[in-house]
């Protein structure tokens, strides 16, 4: 049997204590030896039965006295075997041994759980010499015990290269339950079961767990720690905690919020960062994610022109970085833009729609039906064309750019003319006779210069030749028309 000192006899119906029938004391236990103050010791039980051999190590000295009487075997006296006390209380325990005076330099060391206790511990050794023996009492005190002081303490003494070891003194520090695992906040799918775990330890054991959901007890009877609660599903946010009970009282875990995953809120603050003729860069502020990470977003683009067919273009993109460049748009057009994002539950509603416009672009096509002919009487080249389709002008025409290249006997020079937007004809002076003139025309908007038309060539003869037929933009397939007159 283990010797025990307990704080108080406190039976608790149907909660069996760890050491049934034993006493416990919160006062400093008085062990083996009378205390100077005359304070009465707590109830102690001898750890050995009559006639039972001592459990500690015993040294049998070889030295004999003058009368040649063998010395009795050396051993620590029996002491209290188990001390149970509450956290933050003080405790003092000791080892005692009587050593024949023939032995010098005897020291006692304290060990806890197999490791020597060195340094700043309150260990005091007192010597009480007598005629033949010296009583040595080693005391160990802890002023405010903590759970870490739990353990098995022993005394050791070295004599004649022999080690004498005391019986262990078990210190058990009891307190309120201490959580080793508490429920964690989670985001869960609506109406889907999930588990929460709660674990707490003593001493004293057992530790019993109650679960609390939104301030209502889930289990009306306690469950032994550790406890796993299977929550059968939630339809709305709930707060869970667990209560851990032991004979010392109860400890309540932190309350954790369990959120229900939902579709996200729509993005807000959709704004235009940059516009070009054919693209718009937008950004947005994501809405609340519905307790589930965003997966991707969808940008919806509608032509704002009331005459358009109302079709919606959809562009999918990743949820980050809340930025998207919408491409393949028409120039100088108005668009309505909305953004929606999704998580594992589904798509958000669309953000408030915003209006955005593309800028003017350079025309996307060249003027059509370019014709060139020589007006010899005025020594000019007349050029005519048709303006490009309005849809493909990509802006408001501000004019045309005419490139005319003159090539003769190994020399070549290019000249550029700007023409106002009103007409669809131009006249340029002949620069060189007996030369080929190559004409190309591009439409111009504020957005820039469009592509040039295919080249049209006309031969300008020397002075004195007669009538000239016009040259014109070739039919498809004629790569490089030359009109020789």
């Amino acid at each position: 049997a283990i010797t025990e000192a307990r704080e108080e006899a406190k039976p608790y119906p149907l909660f069996p204590g760890p050491f049934p029938g034993s006493l416990q004391t919160d006062h400093t236990p008085l062990l083996s030896l009378p205390h100077a103050s005359g304070y009465q010791p707590a109830l102690m039980f001898s750890p050995t039965q009559p006639g039972r051999p001592h459990t500690g190590n015993v040294a049998i000295p070889q030295v004999t006295s003058v009368e040649s009487k063998p010395l009795p075997p050396l051993a620590f006296k029996h002491t209290v075997g188990h001390i149970i006390l509450s956290e933050h209380k003080g405790v003092k325990f000791n080892c005692s041994i009587s050593v024949p005076n023939i032995y010098q330099d005897t020291t006692i060391s304290w060990w806890k759980d197999g490791k020597e206790l060195l340094g700043a511990h309150h260990a005091i050794t007192q010597f009480y010499p007598d005629d033949e023996v010296t009583a040595i009492i080693a005391s160990f005190s802890i002023t405010s015990v903590q759970r870490s002081d739990n353990g098995s303490y022993i005394c050791k003494m070295k004599i004649n290269n022999e080690e004498i070891v005391s019986d262990p003194i078990y210190i058990e520090v009891q307190g309120l339950p201490h959580f080793t695992k508490q429920p964690e906040s989670m985001n869960v799918t609506r109406n889907t079961a999930f588990n929460l775990t709660c674990q707490a330890v003593g001493p004293p054991e057992p530790v019993n767990i109650f679960w609390v959901q939104n301030s209502s007890r889930v289990n009306e009877q306690p469950e032994k720690s550790p406890s796993v609660l299977t929550v059968p599903g939630l339809t709305e946010m709930a707060v869970f905690s667990c209560e851990a009970h032991n004979d010392k009282g109860l400890t309540v875990s932190k309350g954790v919020q369990i959120n229900i995953k939902a579709i996200p809120s729509p993005p807000t603050e959709v704004s235009i960062r940059n516009s070009t003729a054919h693209s718009i860069l937008i950004s947005w502020v994501p809405g609340f994610d519905g307790y589930s990470p965003f997966r991707n977003c969808s940008i919806q683009v509608k032509e704002a022109d009331p005459l358009s067919n109302g079709s919606v273009m959809i562009f999918n993109t990743s949820a980050l970085p809340h930025l998207y460049q919408i491409k393949q748009l028409q120039a100088l057009a108005n668009y309505s833009i909305g953004v929606s994002c999704m998580n594992e539950i589904g798509w958000s509603a669309v953000s408030p729609w915003i209006l955005a416009s593309t800028t003017e672009g350079a025309p996307s096509v060249a003027p059509l039906n370019v014709t060139v002919f020589l007006n010899e009487s005025s020594d000019n080249v007349d050029i005519r064309w048709m303006k490009p389709p309005t849809k493909q002008q990509d802006g408001e025409l501000v004019g045309y750019r005419i490139s005319h290249v003159w090539q003769s006997a190994g020399i070549s020079k290019e000249l550029l003319e700007e023409v106002g937007q009103n007409g669809s004809r131009a006249r340029i002076s002949v620069q060189v006779h007996n030369a080929t003139c190559t004409v190309r025309i591009a439409a111009v908007t504020r957005g820039g210069v469009g592509p040039f038309s295919d080249p049209v060539k006309i031969f300008i003869p020397a002075h004195g030749w007669v009538d000239y037929a016009p040259s014109s933009t070739p039919a498809p397939g004629n790569a490089d028309p030359v009109l020789i007159i």
Epitope: L14, N214, S216, N219, P222, T230, P232
Partner: antibody, heavy 118, light 106 residues
Amino acid sequence: QIQLVQSGSELKKPGASVKVSCKASGYTFTNYGMNWVRQAPGQGLKWMGWINTYTGEPTYADDFKGRFVFSLDTSVSTAYLQISSLKAEDTAVYFCATYGHYAWFAYWGQGTLVTVSS
Amino acid sequence: EIVLTQSPDFQSVTPKEKVTITCRASSSVSYMHWYQQKPDQSPKPWIYATSNLASGVPSRFSGSGSGTDFTLTINSLEAEDAATYFCQQWGTKPLTFGQGTKLEIK
């Protein structure tokens, strides 16, 4: 398997007492509380309260405070319902039922009919 | 205490018909349980915590709801479903039951 077996029907005179038993088997008796539920003839179910089989502490619904006593004998895994000063309106079937998480009555006794008549 | 009101009190239904029983609480509750009771028998656990079928309950049964409004649905009624169904709330003491809905087969 888990079973709750209740004592047989009782015919009592007004003013008398009756003790209904509910013997549990197939599980650890002290792990789950025991509820008592009353069903008057042709009526619905009414929760009377429960007893903590771990501590022995009873809890009574407001309408069942006074003449109703829940008790236990854990050595035989049995819960008891005692009604004193019986009245005609106590005529009903009394059920015991285990108390699970979220007050789920997963297992029920077969019911005991108590008839109070002069 | 929370009062649970079931509707209808009584319903006569033909087999294969869809049946819906509602249970309305006088204030919000966390979960609703449902029990089935046949004449001269004890109630049987039927639907746990609003939507979880008890062991052995046919899949034609389902439960739903939250807050104050809860529903037990039978997708395609069968003859063996003739019984009285009771709802019971968890969340506020005392525990209370609905008055019951009796289903009869036409």
